[in-house]
Structure formats: structure tokens, C-alpha cells
Interface confidence: medium
């Protein structure tokens, strides 16, 4: 009897080991299939969106990541209130599960656009480093389904990089002109979005609770039109201490005014940054590591 019990234990352990190995193989197969599908990404092929089949709809990139897809690339998502799915770049590095809402990399896209374009989104949803704005409507759908953290990755022309991170990033609805709400700051680039670099300047420098403005829809706190002067759509105040949709300049101080890609607390108003990625992920994101 004793021998029989020991044999049972040994067999159970073996079964558990085999189950674990099968799971690992499944994950590996999934990743290999992904890699196979994403080979087109850098070639800029039309069909670069990774087709996950119709097994389920994902509300954001964190769900995709936690379902075992660990390769960065374009995926289709459908936030809870969104009437349709749309493509988005998922950054599966940096802890994974990041939904990229904006990217600036080379000046290939025109960001001096009107209200409708910023509302619906525009840009290159094909190439890995393509520039785009996901769309204010989509930002609203995304950020109302749960509490999100916004991470902004910034790089300058001297090969330096910094980041700013905000808890509880929310974008209002159309009725509220896609108003910006941000929570607690952390990071290395300084708090330009909340204007928390001087107690006396918040009234004009903060982007907190600012409505979105474009050249054809002016909701800023300025006598003039910030979006027109700065040639971009953004949550302008009077006018900005951050503007990541500004004009792309191919050098650090080539701007003749402050209309470049600006993060004041890092490089001031007159330095236009080389690259920016704005990405979001649920506050309580926990990677599902198999």
C-alpha cells in the first residue's frame, strides 16, 4: 500500500510538470505565431495589424498582454463604450500592456489639424515608429472604463531620455470638449502638465482641467488663439508649459518661437524634442506572468 501511495504521488508530480510544460509550450507557440505575423511591421506593409482572431475583444493593450501576447505591435482594441474597434500600437516592453495614444518621431505627420481630425484620430497606424494621435473620442472611451496611468517618454537630440508619469489620466467627453484630468506626478522630466514647477504660475501654466483646443475650436484661457499660434491641437491654457503635438523641428533649438514639441521643465520653451511617446495602462495593472 505504501508503495502504491508513493507511486501515485510520483505520477501526480509528473502530471503537474507535464501540464506546466504544455502551458509553456502554448505560450511559446503563441509568441512564435505573433512574431511570424509581425515580421511586416518595419516594412510598413498595409497589413501590419496583428490579427488575434475573433476569440475575444480586448478593451486595451493590457488585456492583450495578459492574454499572452508579449510582442509590441499594432493590435485592434475596443474599449467598453466604443461603438467600433480601432488599431493601436501596444508597447509590450517597459513592463508591458501599454496602449500608445500618441507618438512623435520624425515629423512625417502634420499635427496642425482641426477639431474633427483630433477628435477621430489621425496618422500612421502602420509603421512601428509611425506618428499618430489616437483621437480624443477614443481617449475618452479608453480612460472612462477604468483608472489609467499616463506615461510620457521623452527624448532629446543629445541622446538623453526622461519620462513623466501621471496617475488617473482621464479625457472628458465631447460635451466637455475632451477636458484633461491628471493625478499624481512622478518621473524625471518634471511636472509640466500640471504646471507644478512654481506655485505662482499654475493659473496660466497648468494643463489640468483644460479643454482641448484646435485652430478651429478655441477653448483656451488666452485672449488670442493658442492652437493657431502654436500650430497644434492640445489642452492649452495660456498657452502651455507642455505641448507634445507641437511643430516637429529637426534640431534642438531650430524653433523661432515656442511652438515646437515642448516639455518646459526639462528643456524649456525653446527646445523642440526629438521624440515623444504618450502611453497609458491601468493604474492597477499586474502582468499575468505564466
Amino acid at each position: 500500500l505504501e508503495d502504491c501511495a508513493q507511486e501515485q504521488m510520483r505520477l501526480r508530480a509528473q502530471v503537474r510538470l507535464l501540464e506546466t510544460r504544455v502551458k509553456q509550450q502554448q505560450v511559446k507557440i503563441k509568441q512564435l505565431l505573433q512574431e511570424n505575423e509581425v515580421q511586416f511591421l518595419d516594412k510598413g506593409d498595409e497589413n501590419t495589424v496583428i490579427d488575434l482572431g475573433s476569440k475575444r475583444q480586448y478593451a486595451d493593450c493590457s488585456e492583450i498582454f495578459n492574454d499572452g501576447y508579449k510582442l509590441s505591435g499594432f493590435y485592434k482594441i475596443k474599449p467598453l463604450q466604443s461603438p467600433a474597434e480601432f488599431s493601436v500600437y501596444c508597447d509590450m516592453s517597459d513592463g508591458g500592456g501599454w496602449t500608445v495614444i500618441q507618438r512623435r518621431s520624425d515629423g512625417s505627420e502634420n499635427f496642425n489639424r482641426g477639431w474633427k481630425d483630433y477628435e477621430n484620430g489621425f496618422g500612421n497606424f502602420v509603421q512601428k515608429h509611425g506618428e499618430y494621435w489616437l483621437g480624443n473620442k477614443n481617449l475618452h472611451f479608453l480612460t472612462t472604463q477604468e483608472d489609467y496611468t499616463l506615461k510620457i517618454d521623452l527624448a532629446d537630440f543629445e541622446k538623453n531620455s526622461r519620462y513623466a508619469q501621471y496617475k488617473n489620466f482621464k479625457v472628458g467627453d465631447e460635451k466637455n470638449f475632451y477636458e484633461l484630468n491628471i493625478g499624481e506626478y512622478s518621473g524625471t522630466a518634471g511636472d509640466s502638465l500640471a504646471g507644478n514647477f512654481h506655485p505662482e504660475v499654475q493659473w496660466w501654466a497648468s494643463h489640468q482641467r483644460m479643454k482641448f483646443s484646435t485652430w478651429d475650436r478655441d477653448h483656451d484661457n488666452y485672449e488670442g488663439n493658442c492652437a493657431e499660434e502654436d500650430q497644434s491641437g492640445w489642452w492649452f491654457n495660456r498657452c502651455h508649459s507642455a505641448n507634445l503635438n507641437g511643430v516637429y523641428y529637426s534640431g534642438p533649438y531650430t524653433a523661432k518661437t515656442d511652438n515646437g514639441i515642448v516639455w518646459y521643465t526639462w528643456h524649456g520653451w525653446w527646445y523642440s524634442l526629438k521624440s515623444v511617446v504618450m502611453k497609458i495602462r491601468p493604474n492597477d495593472f499586474i502582468p499575468n506572468v505564466i
Epitope: Y185, N196, H198, P199, E200, R238, D258, W270
Partner: antibody, heavy 120, light 113 residues
């Protein structure tokens, strides 16, 4: 090398006006907020006024509000202080000073100053 | 407005000795959002404009000798010259840049004993 050179000081009667200038060189003038700070003979420092990099924001000390106007011409790299209704207590050396920037209002470069004497 | 009070008004210290200047603000100049003290120290020699020594209460300006150091937080601050040199004879001012109007302390004159 950063240089700030004030001019326009002199002796003026109470109630009259004077315009000070500060010529800036050696840095991108249009990128920085600028200040005027004054120092009465044998006394301490008193901040007078501040203007933002683009001229859109101006702040003044209560003692000069309504009488002094700070302005700038970025195309000429020049800062100005228009002083009206001058009083004896405005007698001082007036310094223009560059703001360090990046969310701070302290002064990293100062001019040599220009003396304004208000006397009848 | 924030009133800055410096003490002592004047100070005589032997060469090589430590000089300590105090500065007190009527309200805190520590900004909780970034945990920084909005306070600077300047040195002014006779017939010259002031020169920036310290900002953010304790950060030394580049080119300033390391015998100068700043400390303190909230409302109480100190400028220390660890080993007084002849060229340090000057008037020293603290300045708050937490709020408008920007204000200076009355100055402390440092002389050699």
C-alpha cells in the same frame, strides 16, 4: 559670454519720467524672463518688476504698480523700464537681471546697474 | 508678501574660520508639489552687482567655491562659509522666489576680524 548693460539713468525731478534700457547679449534673450531689481544708496535689494520671455506676463512690486511699466523688444534684445511719476524714494541703482528659468524666479546674471536720482 | 529676515546684520570672522548667516521667512517657501525650497543666496561686493551663490536653498551655482553651502527648509535657512577667505568680504542676501512679490532679506555684512 552673457552681458547685460543698463542705460538711461540720471537726475530727474519728482513727478517726471525716465526710461531705462537694458541691452542683452551672449544668450538667447527671447528665451528668458527678465527682471528689474533696485538698490537705494547704502540699502538692500528690492525687486521691482518681472516680464515673461514673450512679454505676455508682467508682475510688479506694490511700490511701483501703476507708475512703472516693464517691456521688452526681443528683436532688439532689449529690456525696458518706463518710470513715470517718479518720487524721491525711487532713487536707487537699477539693475536688470536674467531669470534662471525652468520654473524659478531667481537671478543668475546681473548688469552693472544704472543710477537714478530723483531730486528737486 | 513674504518677509525675509536675516541675522546677524554684520559678522566679523577670522580668516580660515567658519561664518554662519541665518535667514528666516515669514511663511514657508517649501513647495509641497515638488518638495523644493524656493530660496536663493547672493553675494555682493562693494561697487559690484550681486552674484548668485546658492539656489533651491542648497544647490551651489557652478563656479562657486565649495566652502559656500546652504541648508535649511520651510522657514529657516543658513548660508555657511566653512573657511573664510579675504575675497569673501561682502554683503550676503537671501531671496525667496516662492511668490510675488519676490523679496530679499536685509543683508548680512561679513568682515574679517
Amino acid at each position: 559670454e552673457v552681458q547685460l548693460v543698463e542705460s538711461g539713468g540720471g537726475v530727474v525731478q519728482p513727478g517726471r519720467s525716465l526710461r531705462l534700457s537694458c541691452a542683452a547679449s551672449g544668450f538667447t534673450f527671447s528665451s528668458y524672463a527678465m527682471h528689474w531689481v533696485r538698490q537705494a544708496p547704502g540699502k538692500g535689494l528690492e525687486w521691482v518688476a518681472l516680464i515673461s520671455y514673450d512679454g505676455s506676463l508682467k508682475y510688479y512690486a506694490d511700490s511701483v504698480k501703476g507708475r512703472f511699466t516693464i517691456s521688452r523688444d526681443n528683436s532688439k534684445n532689449t529690456l525696458y523700464l518706463q518710470m513715470n511719476s517718479l518720487r524721491a524714494e525711487d532713487t536707487a541703482v537699477y539693475y536688470c537681471a536674467r531669470d534662471r528659468g525652468y520654473g524659478s524666479w531667481y537671478f543668475d546674471y546681473w548688469g552693472q546697474g544704472t543710477l537714478v536720482t530723483v531730486s528737486s | 508678501e513674504i518677509v525675509m529676515t536675516q541675522s546677524p546684520d554684520s559678522l566679523a570672522v577670522s580668516l580660515g574660520e567658519r561664518a554662519t548667516i541665518n535667514c528666516k521667512s515669514s511663511q514657508s517657501v517649501l513647495y509641497s508639489s515638488n518638495n523644493k525650497n524656493y530660496l536663493a543666496w547672493y553675494q555682493q561686493k562693494p561697487g559690484q552687482p550681486p552674484k548668485l551663490l546658492i539656489y533651491w536653498a542648497s544647490t551651489r551655482e557652478s563656479g562657486v567655491p565649495d566652502r559656500f553651502s546652504g541648508s535649511g527648509s520651510g522657514t529657516d535657512f543658513t548660508l555657511t562659509i566653512s573657511s573664510l577667505q579675504a575675497e569673501d568680504v561682502a554683503v550676503y542676501y537671501c531671496q525667496q522666489y516662492y511668490s510675488i512679490p519676490l523679496t530679499f532679506g536685509g543683508g548680512t555684512k561679513v568682515e574679517i576680524k
